[in-house]
Interface confidence: low
Amino acid sequence: AITEAREEAKPYPLFPGPFPGSLQTDHTPLLSLPHASGYQPALMFSPTQPGRPHTGNVAIPQVTSVESKPLPPLAFKHTVGHIILSEHKGVKFNCSISVPNIYQDTTISWWKDGKELLGAHHAITQFYPDDEVTAIIASFSITSVQRSDNGSYICKMKINNEEIVSDPIYIEVQGLPHFTKQPESMNVTRNTAFNLTCQAVGPPEPVNIFWVQNSSRVNEQPEKSPSVLTVPGLTEMAVFSCEAHNDKGLTVSKGVQINIKAIPSPPTEVSIRNSTAHSILISWVPGFDGYSPFRNCSIQVKEADPLSNGSVMIFNTSALPHLYQIKQLQALANYSIGVSCMNEIGWSAVSPWILASTTEGAPSVAPLNVTVFLNESSDNVDIRWMKPPTKQQDGELVGYRISHVWQSAGISKELLEEVGQNGSRARISVQVHNATCTVRIAAVTRGGVGPFSDPVKIFIPAHGWVDYAPSSTPAPGNADPVLII
């Protein structure tokens, strides 16, 4: 049977039994081999107990005495089989053996769970020689036990290539429950069930679990570890923890926050990065994500003109990189812009609206009724037109650009003239005689150059020909009017 000792038991006497005189005080060891020193253990367990020698793993010496009597089998004395103690306490345990003096160089090694204990362990071997035998006592001490010290300890001795092994000494370190799995923070959907897991171990077992929500116990009766708490759903943020209980006391897990996923806060810092006539580049800083990643964003644009009845334009874009170029806008217009972003729960409110303006645009219409005729007396070409019906958004007219192309005998030459905004006529010098002159006119604003009018062609004859009639912008359908004068 396994002998068990609890830490509150009285220590055994140091050397009970079978040595003659029980090793009186004047019988000091000849040799002491300490691996560590200076430790007074809180618990000490003796090497032997009354009873028969251990016969499990023995060495039968072949040497006989003068009287030819066989020596008794060599075996470690029985010792305490099971030591139970609390974490951080000290413990000392021994194994002992009596070895006939005919054997030399006997050493004892300590093993734990099948592995030899080497290095800086607190092991001491003491030798007590007598006339025929030497009592060897191997002590092993641990100053402050930890859970990792749990296990089965044995002594081994080699004699004549035979290995003698002691009975195991089982060390059981008990303490407060130790968590192997604690609940984790989560972001959950409102009123949707979710699970939390808590697992703790001893020894001592069993370990029982209580769940705590916002400082109040959830379950009246404990659950054996591991425990899974199914929460049917929350409507607001809560903090959960679990308590692990065993005979040694209570350990409380970390408190974890369970957040309720919500619609995001609206974006902030909507800023205008760049403006053109028909586009606005905006950026924004996303608001709080509502414990759920952003999916995409929506840019809402409406004309800020109070007289405008234009509907809101919506542009959808990805959540990153918090930048969007709004296109298809009118030139020289004011817009109110707001940004909203969504997560899996829904759309945020729109950000505070900001005012943004597009710049002037180029004219969208060409000058009308372009007429060209030759003034032979001054050797000029006169050009007349009507001002285009420019929209307000096109900006203020600053002038016109006239393109005139001269073609003669395979030679082509284009010239450009800029004309101020006040006039609706221009005069250009004849560049080449016996040639065709093609004229186009475009209106110009600060926003750029508008479309050119349809081409009007006029033939410039050699000197001496008569200027009969003008050439003008054709009616629709006449693609290539040429007037020969």
Epitope: T268, S283, V285
Partner: antibody
Amino acid sequence: EVQLQQSGPELVKPGASVRIPCKASGYTFSDYNMDWVKQSHGKSLEWIGNINPNIGGTIYSQKFKGKATLTVDKSSSTAYMELRSLTSEDTAVYYCARGDYGFASWGQGTLVTVSA
Amino acid sequence: DIVLTQSPASLTVSLGQRATISCRASRSVSTSGYSYMHWYQQKPGQPPKLLIYLASNLESGVPARFSGSRSGTDFTLNIHPVEEEDAATYYCQHSREYPFTFGSGTKLEIK
């Protein structure tokens, strides 16, 4: 690990220009703005402006409009700040910082000294 | 521009005691439940280091003895207990709108 590597100190003459690189690594360069901050000796910090590498959009503090120009080279994950028409007032340490909620990542700073 | 007024300009605190630095914004830097105020620590020859973002969120890797709070447009950085390595200059900064601005700084000395 996010890293912003700036170049060494620069000594430039008044009226000249200087271009400071900031090479980013450890994150997707185009996902974050790059902000620039000035610190004159013994003084506080001044935000210069930032650039979004994705499309090159920039914004500047009014004080630095016309003084600083921010650009990026996405192929090398490098942001640049050019300072022009330098005067002694521009002598300072210039930092690049990755734009986010607060500037969690900074370059080590480039000291620009303007001296004849 | 939003002006950030930081006080005091310098502060001497005994080891283990509490250091309190204030930053007042000339107008709100808060919206939608978030305050766009951040705190930095800067030591000589080094770039600033983000300590607190969005008024009260501790940046990853920053010791828990640093904390931030807000009351209206007043923001506070607390360091408790102060350690020797906390000797530095501290700045507040907002990112509510462009341009971002910084406070003038508070130099903390440990005695």
